[in-house]
């Protein structure tokens, strides 16, 4: 069974834990409990393939920022979460993405941009703004509500698909390199 190591990142209080718990336990956690780190596993079927999601729910608080390099190194794909009613959390996405790229030493890391809390009326980040950012990064954008469960499965499953695409691309590139090295001058 294929295992996918997913990491949920983003500023504090954007709903990272609520999204993860909604996926794993099928219920909404209303109270805010700043996460230090939490790790979950769940077996799911995505596009006919049974796979094991290994999900790391991370701290948004700056006091735990020293832990980021460690989990970014092990993650295969990243759910970059902001809250649609928190402009600062949207602006923070750039910093998370840059840190992930630096730690992974790659411009091409599987990611999904997630705009959470889309059930709230107090929106300050336009859908178009987020779509444009995702397009500039070349990654999918999904709006979610951990409260209503809208887009929750879609966000995590899309990230798995991004990891699969990345793996396929890497193996194709590897085969091309082998072919090139075999051709004589």
């Amino acid at each position: 069974m294929t295992e996918y190591k997913l990491v949920v990142v983003g500023a504090g209080d954007v709903g990272k834990s609520a999204l993860t718990i909604q996926l794993i336990q099928n219920h909404f956690v209303d109270e805010y409990d700043p996460t230090i780190e939490d790790s979950y596993r769940k077996q799911v079927v995505i596009d006919g393939e049974t796979c094991l999601l290994d999900i790391l729910d991370t701290a948004g608080q700056e006091e735990y920022s020293a832990m980021r390099d460690q989990y970014m190194r092990t993650g295969e794909g990243f759910l970059c979460v902001f809250a649609i009613n928190n402009t600062k959390s949207f602006e923070d996405i750039h910093h998370y993405r840059e840190q992930i790229k630096r730690v992974k030493d790659s411009e091409d890391v599987p990611m999904v941009l997630v705009g959470n809390k889309c059930d709230l009326p107090s929106r300050t980040v336009d859908t178009k703004q987020a779509q444009d950012l995702a397009r500039s990064y070349g990654i999918p954008f999904i709006e979610t509500s951990a409260k209503t469960r809208q887009g929750v499965d879609d966000a995590f499953y899309t990230l798995v698909r991004e990891i699969r695409k990345h793996k396929e691309k890497m193996s194709k590139d590897g085969k091309k390199k082998k072919k090139k090295s075999k051709t004589k001058c």
């Epitope: 834990s17 336990q25 219920h27 409990d33 700043p34 996460t35 230090i36 780190e37 790790s39 077996q43």
Partner: nanobody, 124 residues
Framework: DVQLQESGGGLVQAGGSLRLSCVAS????????TGWFRQAPGKEREFVAR????????NYADSVKGRFTISRDNAKNTVYLQMNSLKPEDTAVYYC?????????????????WGQGTQVTVSS
């Protein structure tokens, strides 16, 4: 190597209380103790309670809700299970688990690491 050590088990009368403790030798967040399962004679190991690392999110099996309370002290690398209003059917070996939690059907089904267990016997 991660080691989890349970203590606090024993023999108690129905209606009584016990407090179980579980301490981990590992000092990294990923190896901290996370929760408790139990196994009664001739039965499968079953989930009892789980607590997240920051301590604000807890999960309980329906059979222990309102009677058992899970808590943690990260400074001591320890998780506790306060068991009140104990019943004979709570008799089991109680195992502490740590690391990543595997879930199925909305409840924990496994942990990465396990302790050796501590016997709890409730007499009627």
């Amino acid at each position: 190597d991660v080691q989890l050590q349970e203590s606090g088990g024993g023999l108690v009368q129905a209606g009584g209380s016990l407090r179980l403790s579980c301490v981990a030798s590992g000092r990294t967040f990923s190896t901290y103790p996370t929760g408790w399962f139990r196994q009664a004679p001739g039965k499968e190991r079953e989930f009892v309670a789980r607590i997240n690392l920051s301590g604000g999110i807890t999960n309980y099996a329906d059979s222990v809700k309102g009677r058992f309370t899970i808590s943690r002290d990260n400074a001591k690398n320890t998780v506790y299970l306060q068991m009140n209003s104990l019943k004979p059917e709570d008799t089991a070996v109680y195992y502490c688990g740590g690391g990543s939690t595997t879930w199925a059907g909305g409840i924990p089904t496994n942990f990465d690491y396990w302790g050796q267990g501590t016997q709890v016997t409730v007499s009627s």
